[in-house]
């Protein structure tokens, strides 16, 4: 069957009908509905929202909507024994305590079950000691402290500012440095944009606002007690001592009012340079310990949170494909929030809801997509991507055989300046072509395409005539689909101007002030940016599910493979003598990339010419496209990270949010000059080049003529 036989509308009209049905007013209404009370993972409120979404998706017209539950490890503060940090004097008296909660925003004073700020999965403990300020607690920050400044963090409590990298990496780095506790805080330099008022009068972080978040280092494992397998009714669970990724030292987050009180007394070494200074009126001394007058005072943490196995619920909706029902295009985003979730995740969930409604409307008129579309409302994303990962673990055999694409749908906005897209190179052409067909919502670009405004505001660093598209990293629910299973994935949202706003994320991220009013008053009063994101996400799903030939261009992979090979080669060439000594050659990798390029070019030519009315040949060509991403998966995974299996991309070992190319080679080369056994270290570089070259060559051969 051609895809036209699956529908009573012509293909061109399909996409237009779908896009025209999406309404900003509906997204606004859904956002309001989803943000009136907290929906913390594992709570009754979030279970009730799951059932509501299930019911509404059924009403919208999906073929089936099921709840998929798992019992996973979550973390909560002790309701009767709150977490806080003290300054104590020489007698052990608490002379200053950090706040126990955020002052609630106007209109929310009487809302119950607002979880106080905490670092999820922190162990219990009451360490006390001297403070060391470690800037962002990045790998390079600890290098600066330990190697250049000769400051020892062992047995110290470190205080780090949020931003730049995933908080779990900060905690891991602090642990490796020997710290016995970590205090995380939001510095106004990173979370207070100049010229903007604090919430509720603007979108900036007030001094009492605090960023919640998990501090795990799961490396793609999902539930810490059941790595690799679903946390179902008959699961075998590890003991807590063997759990994956749990931090070993107490961690707690605070706002900048409280941080001021801790940092203003700091003594010891001066900050090494201006990049270590934030915007508080404090010296940003590194320590250790407090200055002269206060040198006998110490910092004490009081952490009493508990880890508990708790039931979570995903909502999985199905719209069966008419021609290829065994090919799945997935649109998924999470439902659980830290508090109200005004941006994260409900600005995304509201968009998914409207996309489902639009697809349902078309289905009720007799239309079906060519391929099956699965819609997912994931639970427990904030606790380590748990809902999506457990579901993918449970359904891995189906997904690896049938998964065409995964489109992520967390927060629709993190600003209102321009579009931001991260995706597999296979989707570059789809994204370009789609955005050329959509209208820009931006002021000054009336009547112009989204592609045009996006390119103007966010040009590609390689070529200013094209928009920037970034590598996928992690920190969101696409992780298991892309990094573990090798399913082509993408994400899109509206973002800030990174040139002028150098703060990390958006200021009110994961705070109590992330409300409906934040979005409606300050970010997107007309919901036009939400609508645009709905059109991009929905349009991608539509094309992936309905185009006769999958809208993947394998030539884009050839291009980026060469770019990444050039990059990793130039990193290695910083050590020319060692490369010579240990006979390190990249010839095999460059040869494999060249072969991939030639085969991809020939495949692309065949794709233009083959007989699309022959369903067997069509399916064969589409399968080669679908399985190309899968071909980059190494079943053995990356060293010490078995669930990161993609050889071309992985989350950076130094920042989970960022993507790294040729991660196996990159990590083998990282800080290689400091390795105690250079022969072994360069041997590992050679092994990783071998793995990468083999994988690229093997992937190329999947695109060759089959016989």
């Amino acid at each position: 069957k051609s895809s036209n036989e699956a529908t009573n509308i012509t293909p061109k009209h399909n996409m237009k009908a779908f896009l025209d049905e999406l309404k900003a007013e509906n997204i606004k209404k859904f956002l309001y509905n989803f943000t009136q009370i907290p929906h913390l993972a594992g709570t009754e409120q979030n279970f009730q929202l799951a059932k509501q979404i299930q019911s509404q998706w059924k009403e919208f017209g999906l073929d089936s909507v099921e709840l998929a539950h798992y019992d996973v490890l979550l973390s909560y503060p002790n309701k009767t024994h709150p977490n806080y940090i003290s300054i104590i004097n020489e007698d052990g008296n608490e002379i200053f305590n950090t706040s126990l909660f955020e002052p609630p925003p106007p209109g929310y004073e009487n809302v119950s079950d607002i979880v106080p700020p905490f670092s999820a999965f922190s162990p219990q403990g009451m360490p006390e000691g001297d403070l060391v300020y470690v800037n962002y607690a990045r790998t390079e920050d600890f290098f600066k402290l330990e190697r250049d400044m000769k400051i020892n963090c062992s047995g110290k409590i470190v205080i780090a500012r949020y931003g730049k990298v995933f908080r779990g990496n900060k905690v891991k780095n602090a642990q490796l440095a020997g710290a016995k506790g970590v205090i995380l805080y939001s510095d106004p330099a990173d979370y207070f944009a100049p010229g903007v008022k604090s919430y509720p009068d603007g979108w900036n972080l007030p001094g009492g606002g605090v960023q919640r978040g998990n501090i795990l280092n799961l490396n793609g494992a999902g539930d810490p007690l059941t790595p690799g397998y679903p946390a179902n009714e008959y699961a075998y669970r590890r003991g807590i001592a063997e759990a994956v990724g749990l931090p070993s030292i107490p961690v707690h987050p605070i706002g900048y009012y409280d941080a001021q009180k801790l940092l203003e007394k700091m003594g010891g070494s001066a900050p090494p340079d201006s990049s270590w200074r934030g915007s508080l009126k404090v010296p940003y001394n590194v320590g250790p310990g407090f200055t002269g007058n206060f040198s006998t005072q110490k910092v004490k943490m009081h952490i009493h949170s508990t880890n508990e196995v708790t039931r979570i619920y995903n909502v999985i909706g199905t719209l069966r494909g008419a021609v290829e029902p065994d090919r799945y295009v997935i649109l998924g985003g999470h439902r659980d929030s830290w508090v109200f979730g005004g941006i994260d995740p409900q600005s995304g969930a509201a968009v998914v809801h409207e996309i489902v409604r639009s697809f349902g409307t078309l289905k009720k008129e007799g239309w079906r997509p060519r391929r099956t579309i699965l819609f997912a409302s994931w639970d427990a994303e904030e606790f380590g991507l748990l809902g999506s990962t457990e579901w993918a673990e449970e359904n891995s055999r189906l997904l690896q055989e049938r998964g065409v694409a995964y489109i992520n749908a967390d927060s629709s906005i993190e600003g209102n300046y321009t579009l931001r897209v991260d995706c597999t190179p296979l989707m570059y052409s789809l994204v370009h072509n789609l955005t050329k067909e959509l209208k820009s919502p931006d002021e000054g670009f009336e009547g112009k395409s989204l592609y045009e405004s996006w390119t103007k505001k966010s040009p590609s660093p390689e070529f200013s005539g094209m928009p920037r598209i970034s590598k996928l990293g992690s920190g969101n629910d696409f992780e298991v689909f892309f990094q573990r299973l090798g399913i082509a994935s993408g994400r899109a949202r509206y973002t800030k101007n990174w040139e002028t706003n150098k703060f990390s994320g958006y200021p009110l991220y994961h705070s109590v002030y992330e409300t409906y009013e934040l979005v409606e008053k300050f970010y997107d009063p007309m919901f036009k940016y939400h609508l645009t994101v709905a059109q991009v996400r929905g349009g991608m799903v539509f094309e992936l599910a309905n185009s006769i030939v999958l809208p993947f261009d394998c030539r884009d992979y050839a291009v980026v493979l060469r770019k990444y090979a050039d990059k990793i080669y130039s990193i290695s060439m910083k050590h020319p003598q060692e490369m010579k000594t240990y006979s390190v050659s990249f010839d095999s990798l460059f040869s494999a990339v060249k072969n991939f390029t030639e085969i991809a070019s020939k495949f692309s030519e065949r794709l233009q010419d083959f007989d699309k009315s022959n369903p067997i040949v069509l399916r064969m060509m589409n399968d080669q496209l679908m399985f190309l991403e899968r071909a980059f998966i190494d079943p053995l995974g990356l060293p010490d990270r078995p669930f990161y299996r993609h050889v071309i991309y992985a989350p950076s070992s130094h920042n989970k949010y960022a993507g790294e190319s040729f991660p196996g080679i990159y990590d083998a080369l990282f800080d290689i000059e400091s390795k105690v056994d250079p022969s072994k270290a360069w041997g590992e570089v050679k092994r990783q080049i071998y793995v990468a070259a083999f994988t690229v060559q093997a992937a190329a051969e999947t695109l060759s003529e089959v016989a």
């Epitope: 094209m466 291009v559 060249k594 390029t597």
Partner: nanobody
Framework: EVQLVESGGGLVQAGGSLKLSCVAN????????MAWFRQAPGKEHEFVAA????????NNADSVKGRFTISRDNAKNRVYLQLNSLKPEDTAAYYC????????????????WGQGTQVTVSS
């Protein structure tokens, strides 16, 4: 990463000729296919011509066939575009690009780009 710098542009009368040159840094020049694109005011980038790394094979856009010739000198890390029988519609900024395959005619599929050199053809 490859840095590319174009030169040779200028003002020329219809029917005239120009030779554009593009120099690349780095020792791996011969491993890249090279191309020329052009962009007229208010228009998208248009593929002009490309050449394989060894210089053996070229690919020319229909609009310039028989008039423009691409060539390269790997010893000098240079690629050239000889423009003959110029027409006013050839007026554009001309960009040199390095990439992976000479058959690719979409700008997206080229890796490294120069800043461009302006060619203006007066009637």
């Amino acid at each position: 990463e490859v840095q590319l710098v174009e030169s040779g542009g200028g003002l020329v009368q219809a029917g005239g000729s120009l030779k554009l040159s593009c120099v690349a840094n780095g020792p791996t020049f011969s491993t890249y296919a090279m191309a020329w694109f052009r962009q007229a005011p208010g228009k998208e980038h248009e593929f002009v011509a490309a050449i394989t790394g060894d210089g053996d094979t070229t690919n020319n856009a229909d609009s310039v066939k028989g008039r423009f010739t691409i060539s390269r000198d790997n010893a000098k890390n240079r690629v050239y575009l000889q423009l003959n029988s110029l027409k006013p519609e050839d007026t554009a900024a001309y960009y040199c690009a390095a990439g992976v395959h000479h058959t690719y005619t979409i700008p997206r599929l080229w890796l490294y780009w120069g800043q461009g050199t302006q060619v203006t053809v007066s009637s």
